[in-house]
C-alpha cells in the first residue's frame, strides 16, 4: 500500500503570541497518536509553530487565516 505519512505531534506549545503578519497557514493536530490537541501554524520562513487551540490568540489567528484564504483547512 501507500507509504504512511508520519504524524507530527506537539509535546510543547508556544508561549509567545505570533504576530498575524508572520503566519501563512495552519493545520489542526487531532491524531489519537499525539498526547494533546494542537494547531500548527506555518510561518513565512516556512517553519512550524505548535500552539494551544484553547488560547484566544490562536483562535483569532485561525479565523484571520480562514478569512485570508478561502480554501478549507483540514
Amino acid at each position: 500500500g501507500p507509504a504512511s505519512v508520519p504524524t507530527t505531534c506537539c509535546f510543547n506549545l508556544a508561549n509567545r503570541k505570533i504576530p498575524l503578519q508572520r503566519l501563512e497557514s495552519y493545520r489542526r493536530i487531532t491524531s489519537g497518536k499525539c498526547p494533546q490537541k494542537a494547531v500548527i501554524f506555518k510561518t513565512k520562513l516556512a517553519k512550524d509553530i505548535c500552539a494551544d487551540p484553547k488560547k484566544k490568540w490562536v483562535q483569532d489567528s485561525m479565523k484571520y487565516l480562514d478569512q485570508k484564504s478561502p480554501t478549507p483547512k483540514p
Epitope: 508520519p6 509535546f11 510543547n12 503578519q21 493536530i29 517553519k47 512550524d48
Partner: antibody, heavy 119, light 107 residues
Framework: QVQLQESGPGLVKPSQTLSLTCTVS??????????WNWIRQHPGKGLEWIGY???????YYNPSLKSRITISIDTSKNQFSLTLSSVTAADTAVYYC???????????WGQGTMVTVSS | DIQMTQSPSSLSASVGDRVTITCQAS??????LNWYQQKPGKAPKLLIY???NLETGVPSRFSGSGSGTDFTFTINSLQPEDIATYYC?????????FGQGTKLEIK
C-alpha cells in the same frame, strides 16, 4: 524544562573535521515546532548563526558555511550534531546549541563548548 | 544577508541610570527583532522578542521599541546585575543575523 548540553573535542587540528553533539533533556527532540540550532561566537566577538535542523531532518544552513557543514539528528538518542570540515584557526570559537520554537527566538541555550583549532 | 549595526559598541553607566542601545538593520525588517543579554562566560538569554515584547520572567525595567530599520533597547534603571553584552537579532530572512553587541559596564 528542556535543557541542552554540548559535547565534543576542545582541540581540533587544522584541515580536520570538527564534530559536536547537543543532547536534549527534559523534552523530546521529536516535538513538532522545535528547531534545533547551532550558533558560534569567536573569542571576544559577536554571535554567528550556523544553521538549524527540524525533527523531520529538514535543515537550513548559513550560506557562508554551507559548503563545510552538516547538521544531523538522532531522535532515538535525543541528540543533534554539527560537523564542520576543513577547519582553520578562524573556526576557533565557543559553539552553542539552541532551541527555537518555530518563532525564530532562541529561548533555550546550551552552556557552550570552546573549540580551538590549532596544530 | 541583512546587516545589523549596533551602537554604541560599549558604554559605561551608573546604577539607576537609563541606558539606551540602538540597532539598525540594512533593510526593512518590520518588527522581526529580538534582544539578548549575555553575561561573561554564559550563554545569551532572550529578553525581548518581536521588537517590544518582554520574554516571560524578564524584569520590566527592560524594554524595546522600533520598527522597519531602527530599533531601541532600554534599561530604565540600571542594576548591578545588568552588566553584560547585549545583542540584537533579526529574523526577517534566513540566515539570521546578529548585531555585533554592546558591552555595558558600570561606572
Amino acid at each position: 524544562q528542556v535543557q541542552l548540553q554540548e559535547s565534543g573535542p576542545g582541540l581540533v587540528k587544522p584541515s580536520q573535521t570538527l564534530s559536536l553533539t547537543c543532547t536534549v533533556s527534559g523534552g523530546s527532540i521529536s516535538s513538532g515546532g522545535n528547531y534545533w540550532n547551532w550558533i558560534r561566537q569567536h573569542p571576544g566577538k559577536g554571535l554567528e548563526w550556523i544553521g538549524y535542523i527540524y525533527y523531520s531532518g529538514n535543515t537550513y544552513y548559513n550560506p557562508s558555511l554551507k559548503s563545510r557543514i552538516t547538521i544531523s539528528i538522532d531522535t532515538s538518542k535525543n541528540q543533534f550534531s554539527l560537523t564542520l570540515s576543513s577547519v582553520t584557526a578562524a573556526d576557533t570559537a565557543v559553539y552553542y546549541c539552541a532551541r527555537d520554537g518555530g518563532d525564530d527566538a532562541f529561548d533555550i541555550w546550551g552552556q557552550g563548548t570552546m573549540v580551538t583549532v590549532s596544530s | 544577508d541583512i546587516q545589523m549595526t549596533q551602537s554604541p559598541s560599549s558604554l559605561s553607566a551608573s546604577v539607576g541610570d537609563r541606558v539606551t542601545i540602538t540597532c539598525q538593520a540594512s533593510q526593512d525588517i518590520s518588527n522581526y527583532l529580538n534582544w539578548y543579554q549575555q553575561k561573561p562566560g554564559k550563554a545569551p538569554k532572550l529578553l525581548i522578542y518581536d521588537a517590544s515584547n518582554l520574554e516571560t520572567g524578564v524584569p520590566s525595567r527592560f524594554s524595546g521599541s522600533g520598527s522597519g530599520t531602527d530599533f531601541t533597547f532600554t534599561i530604565n534603571s540600571l542594576q548591578p546585575e545588568d552588566i553584560a553584552t547585549y545583542y540584537c537579532q533579526e529574523y526577517n530572512n534566513l540566515p539570521y543575523s546578529f548585531g555585533q553587541g554592546t558591552k555595558l559596564e558600570i561606572k
